[in-house]
Amino acid sequence: DAGVIQSPRHEVTEMGQEVTLRCKPISGHNSLFWYRQTMMRGLELLIYFNNNVPIDDSGMPEDRFSAKMPNASFSTLKIQPSEPRDSAVYFCASSL
């Protein structure tokens, strides 16, 4: 099993541009989670989906952030417009 697959691995963008992160969960997993990690703020849960439905997006109250899960095998996290403080490692995770 390839595990959770994210793309891109690295992203550099200018402030104000749109950024889209992609995730392919493990096949058969019905929960998907997006996290953000920075030195200053630690690990933050942004949103999670169960059976493609967003359950809790309270970790991303800024409407610059949006996430979708159109089907069981794909999710996107979009930031528009991006800001310097969005610089972080973004993790996608999935579970049964």
């Epitope: 933050e44 309270s58 109250p61």
Partner: antibody
Framework: EVQLVESGGGLVQPGGSLRLSCAAS????????MHWVRQAPGKGLEWVSY????????YYADTLKGRFTISRDNSKNTLYLQMNSLRAEDTAVYYC??????????WGQGTTVTVSS | DNQLTQSPSFLSASVGDRVTITCRAS?????IYWYQQKPGKAPKLLIY???NLAPGVPSRFSGSGSGNEYTLTISSLQPEDFATYYC?????????FGQGTKLEIK
């Protein structure tokens, strides 16, 4: 029916502390974000702080960082605001509000904080 | 911080009038949210995501706009609409409010 009930306000001297509480009912408190907003007498609304469902994401108004601390206890369906080093300009009605529709869809009735010697 | 400026700050109008309140942002925002507040009461959400009416809000209220400029329109003022109106942005923390527009009976 969604209900938010603030408590803990009162009269406090400059430099003092208060802890406000917001008791939530009528919805799944542990599944959503919560805000504090304040309104000084005769003035407009001022956003104070936000906390996500699991407390991993927290934001503060720049002017309040370091003095105010937001927290929550999901087992008690309660939101808190710890306010330290209080100043006269912190005198206001403090509201808790539920995050909903991307905004604040339900508000409490408010609790009054007066900072005066 | 993104500063929101509402105009006018005060507005006198009569029952049946059509009124428009403008909210201008110092930096572009994705959406604007509108609240109504009556004296001694908590604010009430009116419009979310720029143009969506909150549950129970009459259809005489509408919202529009994009970028830096947004509007709240009341098509035909009713006695219960006399209140103070606030815009707010959630595009970027801190989640600033406009200074408010007080709508008074002429």
């Amino acid at each position: 029916e969604v209900q938010l009930v603030e408590s803990g306000g009162g009269l406090v001297q400059p430099g003092g502390s208060l802890r406000l509480s917001c008791a939530a009912s009528g919805f799944t408190f542990s599944n959503g974000g919560m805000h504090w907003v304040r309104q000084a007498p005769g003035k407009g609304l001022e956003w104070v702080s936000y906390i996500s469902s699991g407390s991993s994401t927290i934001y503060y108004a720049d002017t309040l960082k370091g003095r105010f601390t937001i927290s929550r206890d999901n087992s008690k369906n309660t939101l808190y605001l710890q306010m330290n080093s209080l100043r006269a300009e912190d005198t206001a009605v403090y509201y808790c509000a539920r995050r909903g529709e991307g905004a604040m869809d339900y508000w409490g009735q408010g609790t009054t904080v007066t900072v005066s010697s | 911080d993104n500063q929101l400026t509402q105009s006018p700050s005060f507005l006198s109008a009569s029952v049946g009038d059509r009124v428009t309140i403008t909210c201008r942002a110092s930096s572009s925002v994705n959406y604007i949210y509108w609240y109504q507040q009556k004296p001694g009461k908590a604010p009430k959400l009116l419009i979310y995501y720029t143009s969506n009416l909150a549950p129970g809000v009459p259809s005489r209220f509408s919202g529009s706009g994009s970028g830096n400029e947004y509007t709240l329109t009341i098509s035909s003022l009713q006695p219960e609409d006399f209140a103070t109106y606030y815009c707010q942005q959630f595009t970027s923390s801190p989640f600033t409010f406009g200074q408010g527009t007080k709508l008074e009976i002429k």
